[in-house]
């Protein structure tokens, strides 16, 4: 099959602190050395970019400094945070990989991690 | 709104150069895969060339590699296809396309025309 | 390399009828990765279908995809005047990209 598959959580909770972590486990079909992990929200037909990280295999992911994301890899599989989180936010979050080098290309998308996010209530005034 | 024009086309005789370009607008330009699309005259359609986000990756057809660079300019939000050596059979509408973020190709320019002919 | 084979060729059909499009692919392609474009005489293609089954923003309802591994089909419920053009398909999970040959569907 000329298609790459990756797996993800169907369903994640936030933290009260606004912090959601998931797995995203590709099945690669060659030996990619470069490897650029998405990840993406999908609000009825739009999608936007969350964040994105490119990697050499065996090496950190480094996203963007003001980026609300951090990941860790371990072969075929990426371990991603998403930070800064608020109700508005819950959504279909989807894990995008790409084999990019060496040829051939490979896309793999995720069937998407739906990210419930519950902001905390704020805490009552004291009397003492 | 977003948008692709495509710029460069002419006629040219074989063995000869051209350069076409595609300027985008309307999007970040540097989050999107960009690719080049041909159609020979009365033809269907026919995947040219992709560069990927900071340029570093790219991929060509085989009826082009070695013949055709393509390339981009984040900075300009532009994107290029430089045409060496051309052949008859490279004639047709070049088209620029963007690849969305789940892959397929959701924007396209309107198309510019190269003709080989001696 | 897949190779994406469409049939028919030509489609002839009146306006209100319903319009079948296949395609076949060379060998299995993931359903995420599969793709239906529209061209009209003079103009670019234009996204329909992508991921096998989602339509393209501002694409009407009347136009559907469906399949999976390596047979693919677009439906068009009932046609409209618009609506006939060459349709293609395309598979985009792996490089290289490559289209069908295209069915063309003209006016009865």
């Known amino acids: 099959c000329k298609a790459m598959h990756v797996a993800q959580p169907a369903v994640v909770l936030a933290s009260s602190r606004g912090i959601a972590s998931f797995v995203c486990e590709y099945a690669s079909p060659g030996k990619a050395t470069e490897v650029r992990v998405t990840v993406l929200r999908q609000a009825d037909s739009q999608v936007t970019e969350v964040c994105a990280a490119t990697y050499m295999m065996g090496n950190e992911l480094t996203f963007l400094d003001d980026s609300i994301c951090t990941g860790t890899s371990s072969g075929n599989q990426v371990n991603l945070t998403i930070q800064g989180l608020r109700a508005m936010d819950t959504g279909l979050y989807i894990c995008k990989v790409e084999l990019m080098y060496p040829p051939p290309y490979y896309l793999g998308i995720g069937n998407g991690t739906q990210i419930y996010v519950i902001d905390p209530e704020p805490c009552p005034d004291s009397d003492f | 709104q977003v948008q692709l024009v495509e710029s460069g086309g002419g006629v040219v005789q074989p063995g000869r150069s051209l350069r076409l370009s595609c300027a985008a607008s309307g999007f970040t330009f540097s989050r999107y895969g960009m690719h080049w699309v041909r159609q020979a005259p009365g033809k269907g359609l026919e995947w040219v060339a992709v560069?990927?986000?900071?340029?570093?990756?790219?991929y060509y057809a085989d009826s082009v590699k070695g013949r055709f660079t393509i390339s981009r300019d984040n900075s300009k939000n532009t994107l290029y296809l430089q045409m060496n050596s051309l052949r008859a059979e490279d004639t047709a509408v070049y088209y620029c396309?963007?690849?969305?973020?789940?892959?397929?190709?959701?924007?396209w320019g309107q198309g510019t025309m190269v003709t080989v002919s001696s | 390399e897949i190779v994406l084979t469409q049939s028919p060729g030509t489609l002839s059909l009146s306006p209100g009828e319903r319009a079948t499009l296949s395609c076949g692919a060379s060998q299995s392609v993931g359903s995420n990765y599969f793709a239906w474009y529209q061209q009209k005489p003079g103009q670019a293609p234009r996204l329909l279908i992508y991921?096998?089954?989602s339509r393209a923003t501002g694409i009407p309802d009347r136009f559907s995809g469906s399949g999976s591994g390596t047979d693919f089909t677009l439906t068009i419920s009932r046609l409209e005047t618009e609506d006939f053009a060459v349709f293609y398909c395309q598979h985009y999970g792996s490089s290289p990209w490559t289209f069908g040959q295209g069915t063309k569907v003209e006016i009865k």
């Open positions: 396309a963007r690849a969305g973020h789940l892959g397929a190709f959701d924007i």
């Open positions: 560069i990927w986000y900071d340029g570093s990756n790219k």
């Open positions: 991921g096998a089954s």
